[in-house]
């Protein structure tokens, strides 16, 4: 085999299979989970109906210095069409729930297992 | 205000490359995801990519992911498209966007024409 | 692949209310999908309308609004004006790519 210099780039991700790996990555973060993620850090609740993957990286964008999720931070940035950053919260219309890091993982992770197995990857 | 300021028209044999670039004037690029788009003669719009410039993190739709490269330079406020193995068929106006949530495609280049012809 | 399709072509009046869908062959259209509504004059000049499904981009008359309507997104020019002639295109996001439809010319008369 012939290296021709540089990195081949990866082929084109399948929505689906995009999705397949957030939903790996939050299972992986679940299962591994010792002390308190994040330090018990505290996010925003979102509305997971409602624009979920810029909602939920609007929420997890301001939790700094978690490795366990800086992973999960990075996939769902390619999730949303605008960029975010910390301190944004543009599309949180509301923002009136914190809850620990670890639960708004559970819970996000549910709503996509179920969006998977309804094949809705959009 | 607001500018997105494009390279000229071009004029390539099939088979080359192209370079496009995008300067950005009244905002800086690192600050938004940077958005590119074509259009074919008379024709619909095509989204072929975007590009975080303050990572380079890119996205590409896939009927373009071997084809485009998408890069920035934040020193000068510009995003490239880079276009490779030019078909008659990639003859088009190729277009640099700014998008936000606020702004969603709200700036548009002026457009570059590139002409793939023998 | 997914595709993305909208009415062709849409007449109205000065002062009518019309509206422009958007559907997507990969199912119902969700607030997921963040539709865009992009408006294209004579020249190629391009305004981004409506972003996010329902966010109507600064500067944009209130006359136009997003939304989904069934399965559908939606774009609504209540009391549409002659200078409203023009064609809109929408884009869907497919969680890491956009897809546009091949837009719908509005003619004022």
């Known amino acids: 085999l012939t290296c021709l210099g540089g990195f081949a780039s990866p082929g084109p991700v399948p929505p689906s299979t995009a999705l397949r790996e957030l939903i790996e990555e939050l299972v992986n973060i679940t299962q591994n989970q010792k002390a308190p993620l994040c330090n018990g850090s505290m996010v925003w609740s979102i509305n997971l109906t409602a624009g979920m993957y810029c909602a939920a990286l609007e929420s997890l964008i301001n939790v700094s210095g978690c490795s366990a999720i800086e992973k999960t931070q990075r996939m769902l940035s390619g999730f949303c069409p605008h960029k975010v950053s910390a301190g944004q919260f543009s599309s949180l219309h509301v923002r009136d729930t914190k809850i620990e890091v670890a639960q708004f993982v559970k819970d996000l992770l549910l709503h996509l297992k179920k969006l998977f197995r309804e094949g809705q990857f959009n | 205000e607001v500018q997105l300021q494009q390279s000229g028209a071009e004029l390539v044999l099939p088979g080359a490359s192209v370079l496009l670039s995008c300067t950005a004037s009244?905002?800086?690029?690192?600050?938004?995801?940077m958005h590119w788009v074509l259009q074919r003669t008379e024709q619909g719009l095509e989204w072929i990519g975007r590009i975080d410039p303050e990572d380079g993190e890119t996205k590409y739709a896939p009927k373009f992911h071997d084809k485009a490269t998408l890069t920035a330079d934040t020193s000068s406020n510009t995003a490239y498209l880079q276009f490779s193995s030019l078909a008659s068929e990639d003859t088009a106006v190729y277009y640099c966007?700014?998008?936000?949530?606020?702004?969603?495609?709200?700036?548009w280049g002026q457009g570059t024409l590139v002409t793939v012809s023998a | 692949q997914a595709v993305v399709t909208q009415e062709s072509v849409l007449t109205t009046s000065p002062g009518e209310t019309v509206t422009l869908t958007c559907r997507s062959s990969t199912g119902a259209v969700t607030t997921s999908n963040y539709a865009n509504w992009v408006q294209e004059k004579p020249d190629h000049l391009f305004t981004g309308l409506i972003g996010?499904?329902?966010n109507r981009a600064p500067g944009v008359p209130a006359r136009f609004s997003g939304s989904l309507i069934g399965d559908k997104a939606a774009l609504t020019i209540t009391g549409a004006q002659t200078e409203d002639e023009a064609i809109y295109f929408c884009a869907l996001w497919y969680i890491n790519h956009f897809i546009f439809g091949s837009g719908t010319k509005v003619t004022v008369l």
């Open positions: 009244g905002f800086n690029i690192k600050d938004y995801y």
């Open positions: 996010g499904t329902n």
């Open positions: 966007t700014r998008y936000d949530y606020y702004g969603p495609f709200a700036y």
